[in-house]
């Protein structure tokens, strides 16, 4: 039956040759006439390669539906299927002409220098490597490498087929790199091309869906999800996918091989499913399938439909942070919503932005969190389709574990007088404010480097027992004081005193502070002597560039070979509980002063003077004496600490300010400096001298104008000066009302 | 709960035909690779035939290539076995089994053939 | 094909004591992506077959953690430890590296 015209019942076309095979020589001439009843066309080996140049088709001249194929010089090439079809139809007669070529027996494929052959290694398939034959009845092997190995037919599962080519079991071939037909024909050897083996499966190495996860669409937005199957070289791939709402008529599934790279040992296929306007009924899993026939995979993902863009907070956001100083805080922005928010954070109203501190992102995040870091932080949610906005603040408190201010925690303490009345502080900054601050003591001698004790010079006191300073049996007696609250550099601190009644015995106090967050220790060596005595000249804290003198002074009759020593920098404790290092058990670590020696009647003075002081003059003396008749050291440790200069600086501002004739002012002007500067005052750029109307009290930082009058009126500047300079602040004191007219008083005192 | 039924065994003469049906229920038939295997009565397994979750691809085991042909109806939720020029060394329990991954997790209760003149 | 062997035919076991079954491949089961294709079945009398393990020591789900596959790339390994009347049965293992799937010829594990 006619495909293209089914009304009309066509002959099939008839060919000039009535055979199946036609075989012929090589060099001669193919010409076949093909007749029908409409238009023919005809279909030759080869016919889209260049060799068309040679095939001549022509009308014949006796009559219509009539045409010739001519190929002049025929080749081994030229044999194949010669087919003449009336267009359009499935209707064809076909003839098969070998052309005999002895030198080239196989039919070359063209322009292909190599073919490919695909198998598995399954014992239950065979290949065929297509080695066509020009020649019917050829004596035709196979031959594989390597190793070298030749198969012939067998009459069973290995033939030879001239139109067909070598067919053979494919695991008998597995092992090769690749194989070739060989032809004998007079003892002559004949190869057909190399075919390159490439051993392929059935097995699906994975099935990935994309987007893999967190899937969130609102209603009538399209869903597009890719299924991939990856797998061995010649699978085969079924697709199928289970989904909510199965029977949706918006549904569109492709399925398609994905290009893989030349080389790859893998195949990709792909599936998409499509869905165009979705609705809530579709929320659920979505699963695909892939299936080679002997192995299926899937994988699932869920997809969440929204009735509409929303933006919500999640029940797990949380409004109070609390961290310790040093930790890395993160605050993530818990929400619901679709599309994903845009995300924006703000610390006291003041947006944030990333840097190498801080992360601000969904997860607010902070390296390494400081007492600075404390406030309310805003998180604010935008939806980028709706713009609809929620905010929420965090509360972040960061806590500061005890941290016990006083210098002396880093380097050897002072030695005391014996008999003295002292004080041992401790200043304590923490938040929260420490919970309690306890005292504890241990007898130096307990203490002390014994060779039967492990002693590291990080750790120089094998102290294991430290008693509770209300147990001061065998040492000092002892009082605590109650703790004091102090602004110290503006921050709250714990002050906690501990008062030797009098000194009597060497010890080492410590005092423990905790809190919540933990816990800070102090260990004071309180070293008693009998012995030298230091004192300092003047008796205050020197400044830079100022002169200071260190009076060592001691009993002739009692001690010799008295020297000035200064502590050469220790390594500082690193450990909480570290102790300071016993400084007249380690003379390794001191420097030898010069100084001057005087005496007077009962006592030896060692000076040692210090022109200019600087700051790297600080740090810890020692005076060494030698007792003349035991020949101990007894030394003694003073702490110097030199002020850095600081120019003037005044703090808080002066007011402007309107009184009445007849009230009073009250003003302080507070400076700051090292040298402590000097305050003056000006009103209206003149200096303002005491009378009685005029008070200048505290080193005249405080001012007081009693009963005012209109005079009194005007600029008033506050200027501190000191060696380094000035500063000076200045308000305007507005007089209101009516002058009073009095002769008890003409004060007034302006120069 | 995931069942498999199998159902069309019986007694068949050497070179006789007959069709093997698993009714299969309790999960998305379609969504997973269905294969037969087969019990001798010395109690071997042989896997005969397995199908791809669209039955466009199909494997034989040699012993049965060109006699038997496997099938599926997704919309019945069934697999078939059709057996042709059956013989004695045929007579065995028939399988069908679930496939994911390779592995078949579930097998029905089996249907029994016996090839015999 | 390759070619799954279970040497012992039968193998009698006392409740309550462990026991090893051993299966053994004419090629490694081992695959080029790292995994080792060898599934374990039971089949109990008058049940079809269950799986219990795959990739050689997966249990499949539902399994009791009494049982624990092991093995090479040829040999392999079903241990079971405190033997239960309900692990009576025939035990087959099975490849899956290479299409035909080939079964071993089963052990029945039967009470003394």
């Known amino acids: 039956a006619s495909v293209g015209l089914p009304s009309v019942s066509l002959d099939l076309p008839r060919l000039s040759i009535q055979k199946d095979i036609l075989t012929i020589k090589a060099n001669t001439t193919l010409q076949i006439t093909c007749r029908g009843q409409r238009d023919l066309d005809w279909l030759w080996p080869n016919n889209q390669s260049g060799s068309e140049q040679r095939v001549e088709v022509t009308e014949c001249s006796d009559g219509l539906f009539c045409k010739t194929l001519t190929i002049p010089k025929v080749i081994g090439n030229d044999t194949g299927a010669y087919k003449c079809f009336y267009r359009e139809t499935d209707l064809a007669s076909v003839i098969y002409v070998y052309v005999q070529d002895y030198r080239s027996p196989f039919i070359a494929s063209v322009s292909d220098q190599h073919g490919v052959v695909y198998i598995t290694e399954n014992k239950n398939k065979t290949v065929v490597i297509p080695c066509l034959g020009s020649i019917s009845n050829l004596n035709v092997s196979l031959c594989a490498r390597y190793p070298e190995k030749r198969f012939v037919p067998d009459g069973n599962r290995i033939s030879w087929d001239s139109k067909k080519g070598f067919t053979i079991p494919s695991y008998m071939i597995s092992y090769a790199g690749m194989v070739f037909c060989e032809a004998k024909i007079n003892d002559e050897s004949y190869q057909s091309i190399m075919y390159i083996v490439v051993v392929v499966g059935y097995r699906i190495y994975d099935v990935v869906l994309s987007p893999s996860h967190g899937i969130e669409l609102s209603v009538g937005e399209k869903l597009v999800l890719n299924c991939t199957a990856r797998t061995e070289l010649n699978v085969g791939i079924d697709f199928n996918w289970e989904y909510p709402s199965s029977k949706h008529q918006h549904k569109k599934l492709v399925n398609r091989d994905l290009k893989t790279q030349s080389g790859s040992e893998m195949k990709k296929f792909l599936s998409t499913l499509t869905i165009d306007g979705i609705t809530r009924s579709d929320q659920g899993l979505y699963t695909c399938a892939a299936s080679s026939g002997l192995m299926t995979k899937k994988n699932s993902t869920f997809v969440r439909v929204h009735e509409k863009p929303f933006v919500a907070f999640g029940s797990g956001m949380e409004s109070l942070v609390e961290a310790t100083v040093g930790e890395r805080v993160r605050i993530p922005a818990k929400y619901l919503g679709y599309p994903p928010p845009e995300i924006k954070w703000y610390k006291n109203g003041i947006p944030l932005e990333s840097n190498h501190t801080i992360k601000a992102g969904h997860v607010l995040t902070i390296m390494e969190v400081s007492e600075r870091d404390t406030g309310n932080y805003t998180v604010i949610l935008t939806n980028p389709i709706s713009k609809e906005k929620q905010s929420h603040v965090v509360s972040l408190v960061v806590y500061v574990p005890p941290q016990i201010g006083e210098k002396s925690l880093i380097s050897p303490v002072d030695s005391y007088q014996y008999g003295t009345t002292q004080t041992l502080t401790c200043t304590v900054y923490a938040i929260p404010p420490p919970h309690h601050i306890h005292w504890y003591w241990q007898l130096e001698e307990e203490c002390a480097n014994e060779p039967s004790h492990a002693v590291s010079v990080t750790n120089p006191y094998p102290c294991e027992e430290w008693r509770s300073v209300e147990d001061f049996q065998g040492g000092n007696k002892i009082e605590v004081n109650k703790n004091q609250f102090a602004l110290i550099e503006g921050k709250n601190k714990t002050v906690s005193t501990l008062v030797i009644q009098a000194a009597n015995v060497s010890a080492l106090y410590k005092c423990e502070a905790v809190n919540k967050v933990g816990r800070g220790e102090r260990v004071i060596s309180f070293h008693v002597t009998r012995g030298p005595e230091i004192t300092l000249q003047p008796d205050m804290q020197p400044t830079e560039q100022e002169s200071v003198s260190l009076w060592c002074t001691a009993d002739r009759s009692t001690f010799e070979n008295l020297t000035w020593y200064k502590l050469g920098p220790q390594p500082l404790p690193i450990h909480v509980g570290e102790l300071p290092t016993p400084v007249c058990k380690n003379l390794d670590t001191l420097w030898k002063l010069n100084a001057t020696m005087f005496s007077n009647s009962t006592n030896d003075i060692l000076i040692m003077e210090l022109k200019n002081a600087s700051l790297q003059d600080q740090g810890d003396y020692v005076c060494l004496a030698q007792d003349r008749k035991t020949k101990k050291r007894h030394c003694v440790v003073r702490q110097l600490t030199v002020l850095e200069r600081v120019a003037p600086t005044i703090t808080g501002n002066l007011e402007n300010q309107t009184t009445s004739i007849g009230e009073s002012i009250e003003v302080s002007c507070t400076a700051s400096g090292n040298p402590p500067p000097q305050i003056m005052w000006f009103k209206d750029n003149e200096t303002l001298v005491e009378d009685s109307g005029i008070v200048l009290k505290d080193g005249n930082r405080n001012l007081t104008i009693r009963r005012v009058r209109k005079e009194d009126e005007g600029l008033y500047t506050c200027q501190a000066c000191s060696v380094l300079g000035c500063a000076k602040v200045e308000a305007f004191f507005i007089i209101e009302g009516a002058q009073e007219k009095t002769n008890l008083e003409h004060h007034h005192h302006h120069h | 709960e995931v069942q498999l039924v199998e159902s069309g065994g019986g007694l068949v003469k050497p070179g006789g035909s007959l069709k093997l049906s698993c009714a299969a229920s309790g999960f998305t038939f379609s969504m997973y690779g269905m294969s037969w295997v087969r019990q001798t009565p010395g109690k071997r397994l042989e896997w005969v035939a397995s199908?791809?979750?669209?039955?466009?691809?199909?494997y034989y085991a040699d012993s049965v290539k060109g006699r038997f042909t496997i099938s599926r109806d997704n919309a019945k939720n069934t697999l078939y076995l059709q057996m042709n020029s059956l013989k004695a060394e045929d007579t065995a329990v028939y399988y069908c089994?679930?496939?994911?991954?390779?592995?078949?997790?579930?097998w029905g209760q089996g249907t029994t053939l016996t090839v015999s003149s | 094909d390759i070619v799954i062997t279970q040497d012992e035919l039968s193998l009698p076991v006392t409740f309550g004591e462990s026991v090893s079954i051993s299966c053994r491949s004419s090629k490694s089961l081992l695959y080029k992506d790292g995994k080792t294709y060898l599934n374990w079945f039971l089949q109990r009398p008058g049940q079809s077959p269950q799986l219990l393990i795959y990739?050689?020591?997966t249990r499949a789900s539902g399994v009791s953690d009494r049982f624990s596959g092991s093995g090479s790339g040829t040999d392999f390994t079903l241990k079971i430890s405190r033997v239960e009347a309900e692990d009576v049965g025939i035990y087959y293992c099975?490849?899956?590296?290479?299409?035909?799937?080939?079964f071993g010829s089963g052990t029945k594990l039967e009470i003394k």
């Open positions: 199908i791809s979750i669209g039955g466009s691809y199909t």
């Open positions: 099975q490849q899956l590296v290479e299409y035909p799937f080939t």
């Open positions: 990739l050689m020591s």
């Open positions: 089994a679930r496939e994911l991954d390779g592995n078949y997790d579930y």
